[in-house]
Every structure is written in C-alpha cells, then in structure tokens.
C-alpha cells in the first residue's frame, strides 16, 4: 500500500521517497511527510522560513489530535489557548487569558474571580469564622483579683480565609467590660490570667496543697475567694444569656 | 498519469437514488483519498465525501444522512449514492483524489458529470 | 464547520494587471488552504496547496501566502489564459469547505 502511494506521489512530485524517516508512509526532499502510517498524526513543523511535514504518535503543546478514517493530523488549538483537548475545550490558557469551562477569556463571568497564580476563573471563596469560643475570666491589668470592674474577652477561629473578592473577615476578637465582686489576691498571686492556671513554686513554708491550679479547682480544698469567684462567673453567663451587654470589639 | 472518469444517469426523479461511478486508471484505490465534490449550475464547490484506501469514508454532516460512498476495487472503482433527491441536488459531481496532508489537495479531478433532478 | 469567505466575488483587470484574490476563514486553519482554477465547463485545477506551494507545471506568477485565517492569491501579471473562476479550500479539519469564488473578467 505504501509502495502504490509512493508509486503515485512520484509523479506528481519528483523528489518523492519510499524510502521515508520515522512514521511517515510517503515523504519528499521539499515537502518531507506527505503522508503518515496508520495512528501517527500530519503536523507542520516550522524549519526556519520553511514548513515541512512531520508524523508523529500525539501532537506538540498548542495542538490537538484529530482523527477522520485513515487520516490523521494535528490541529491548531483556538488563537488565545496554549493547551487543548478539542477545538472547543481548552486546558491552559495564554498569557493575559483565564480559563473557565474549557474557555479562554479576557475577563472571568460574573460570580467568578480571576486566580492570578492558576489563571482560571474560580468561585468567589466568602471569609467563614468558627462559633465564639466562651468569655475569658474577668480581668484588669492581667490579673483576676484585687479590683471590681474589668474586662473579659472572648475569641473565634478564622475557618474560611476569603478570596480576593470575597467578604472580608468579621472581628475575631471581641472585648466587654464586666464587674466582679473585688476579692483581695492572695499573698504573691499574680493573677492567673484567663484559663491558664500556671502551676506556680509555692512560697517557704507554703505547701503545694494550698496553691490551686485547674485540678485543684475543682478538688474539696478550695478557699471561699475561689468559691465566690466560681459563683460569679456562673452569675456572668446566665446575665450573658438574658441581655446583650455594650461590646468592644477589636480586629486581629 | 492519473485519470478519473464520472459515469452515471444524466437525470434523476425527485425522492430517487441519485447514483454514480468513478473508474480510476493510472493508480490504484488502494491507496489515497477519494472524494466526491458537487456544483449546481453556476454555483460554488460542495465537498461530499471521501473513502479511504483501506475502504473507510467519511461525508460532509450536512449530507450524511444520504450518502454512501463504497468501492470495487477490483474494478478499481469508487461510487457514490445519494437518496432521496430533489432539485436542489442538481449539479455537475466531480470525484477527486489527494494523498495526505502534505501534498496537493485535489491533485486529480474526473471531468465532471451533470446529473438533473426532475421529473 | 469553517466558513471561508472569498473576495471579491468578480473583478475586471486587464492583460498584465497584478491580482490579488483574498480567502479569510472563520477560524485559524494553520496553512492548509489551497487554491484552485475553474474555467467554463471545466473541472477545476489545482494551483497552490499548503498556502504557497505551487503545484508542478503552475507558472510562478501564481503565489499564495497568509497565516492564520487571512490568506492571499496573487497573480502578479494576468495573462489571457488567467480569466476564470478562481476557488479557495481548506482542508484543516472536516467537513473541508471551498469559498464561494472570483470571477476574474476581462477588462
């Protein structure tokens, strides 16, 4: 078969070689690949001002495969795309282009955002943020005695960090005033900021017993300041519950 | 030199089977493309079809439904068969061959037959 | 399907005029466009495939060239035998479509 269309080609241009490079089933001096063997895919190949056929097993970056019966070529992928699948489904998109649904274009539809690092058209991603996380003990100055009115605190986790065009995160901080009922600090507490007790080394003469840290609350061995603060801090949550007091609040 | 000769019924009736031979001398149908292409009177070229030389064809979609392409290669022909016709199927059927990518397209043409639709 | 649009449609130039025939396809088709001649009665003829290459036997004042989907026949001194119907084809993909033809006529 491939000797009929040498045969053929011959005539029709003088050059023409059975004897042809790599895939291809009839070739010339001027022209190179004719034609190819059966599966390989006819691509022009650029050699300086001139353009000459090749055959190859799958077609270069910036083309497609097509295939017709018993003809094979590479096809050109649209002006703006770099990578396709077909004529109508791009992979990659050039320079200045952003791929959406196999598409290249100027600028991404809206509800979409352009993705500078990817160049697609992607979903505007919203800031989402966890539930408050519960208030901090009231505290003045670092320290959870010695005075009456102070402030508490309480936090929440950013879950969700929003894309460029996507809501802008809500405070996660969130700062109120509050009254305690004044209770002296013992001789050298420092205060034991929020939730973290740390386990301090007790005074001379001081056992261990008697400095409290988190078991320590809740043992039988607690001191009736500590009792008294325990009290008030349920008093805090149910009055938390029952009115919404004036909040502070401050973005980190 | 390659030579290509139409041969067929000079007129068809409406809703018939308009149908058509290409007998090929100088090479062999076993290897190339050929193709079947069509003018109306006065009118620009339409690309029908082909078959290949392994005997695979593939027509224009927009005639699909209606053609059939086949071939004997012992008599080293090629056919064309389009059913149900009417008058805007009136034109000279030229069959035509290529052998790739990289040589002349339609290098050799049959002289063209004029096939009417009419009753 | 690529639509190829021809222009123009007839033009009237004399022995010796340079002519230039335009094809432009509806999308890119990477130089596979090919240009034929049609005189009255006649089979088409084949002049230039690939955008520039001229068929053996296709006197050098026919040219092609173009890229993209612009593409350019030129016939640098008409000669009485040009006058005919000239027909653009691409064959980048299936199904191949023609232009709709220049009539090139005697001034």
């Known amino acids: 078969q491939n000797a009929s269309r040498g045969r053929r080609q011959r005539r029709m241009h003088p050059n023409v070689s059975q004897g042809c490079q790599g895939g291809c089933a009839t070739c010339s001096d001027y022209n190179g690949c004719l034609s190819c063997k059966p599966r390989l895919f006819f691509v022009l190949e650029r050699i300086g001002m001139k353009q000459i056929g090749v055959c190859l097993s799958s077609c270069p970056s910036g083309y497609y495969g097509t295939r017709y019966p018993d003809i094979n070529k590479c096809t050109k992928c649209k002006a703006d795309c770099d990578t396709c699948f077909n004529k109508n489904f791009c992979t990659k998109c050039k320079s200045g282009f952003y791929l959406h649904l196999g598409k290249c274009l100027d600028n991404c539809p809206e509800g979409l955002e352009a993705n500078n690092h990817t160049m697609e058209c992607v979903n505007i991603v919203h800031c989402e943020v966890s539930e408050w996380n519960p208030w901090s003990p009231c505290t003045k100055k670092g320290k959870t005695c010695g005075f009456k009115r102070g402030t508490e605190t309480r936090v929440r986790e950013i879950m969700q960090h929003p894309s460029a065009k996507g809501n802008l995160c809500p405070p996660t901080n969130e700062t109120r005033k509050c009254t305690v009922q004044r209770k002296k600090c013992q001789k050298g507490e420092r205060g034991k900021k929020g939730r973290e007790r740390k386990r301090k080394k007790p005074n001379k003469g001081e056992s261990k017993e008697a400095i409290p840290d988190s078991k320590g609350l809740e043992s039988s061995k607690e001191t009736p300041e500590q009792r008294e603060n325990k009290q008030q801090q349920k008093k805090r949550k149910v009055q938390d519950k029952q009115q919404k007091s004036v909040s502070v609040s401050t973005v980190h | 030199e390659v030579q290509l000769v139409e041969s067929g019924p000079g007129l068809v009736k409406p809703s018939e089977t308009l149908s058509l031979t290409c007998t090929v001398s100088?090479?062999?149908?076993?290897?190339?493309?050929w193709n079947w292409i069509r003018q109306p009177p006065g009118k620009g070229l339409e690309w029908i079809g082909y078959i290949s030389y392994s005997g695979k064809t593939y027509q224009n979609p927009s005639l699909k439904s209606r053609v059939t392409i086949s071939r004997d290669t012992s008599k080293n022909q090629f056919s064309l068969k389009l059913s149900s016709v009417t008058a805007a199927d009136t034109a000279v059927y030229y069959c035509?061959?290529?052998?790739?990518?990289?040589?002349?397209?339609?290098?050799?043409w049959g002289q063209g037959t004029l096939v009417t639709v009419s009753s | 399907d690529i639509q190829m649009t021809q222009s123009p449609s007839s033009l009237s130039a004399s022995v010796g005029d340079r002519v230039t025939i335009t094809c432009k396809a509806s999308?890119?088709?990477?130089?596979?466009l090919s240009w034929f001649q049609q005189k009255p009665g006649k089979a088409p003829k084949t002049l230039i495939y690939?955008?520039?290459r001229l068929v053996d036997g296709v006197p050098s004042r026919f040219s092609g060239s173009g890229s993209g989907t612009d593409y350019t026949l030129t016939i640098s001194s008409l000669q009485p035998e040009d006058f005919a119907t000239y027909y653009c084809?691409?064959?980048?993909?299936?199904?191949?479509?023609f232009g709709q033809g220049t009539k090139v006529e005697i001034k």
């Open positions: 690939l955008t520039n």
């Open positions: 999308q890119d088709i990477d130089s596979y």
């Open positions: 100088g090479d062999s149908i076993t290897s190339g493309y």
């Open positions: 084809l691409h064959y980048d993909e299936f199904p191949l479509t």
């Open positions: 035509a061959t290529y052998y790739g990518y990289g040589g002349p397209w339609f290098a050799y």
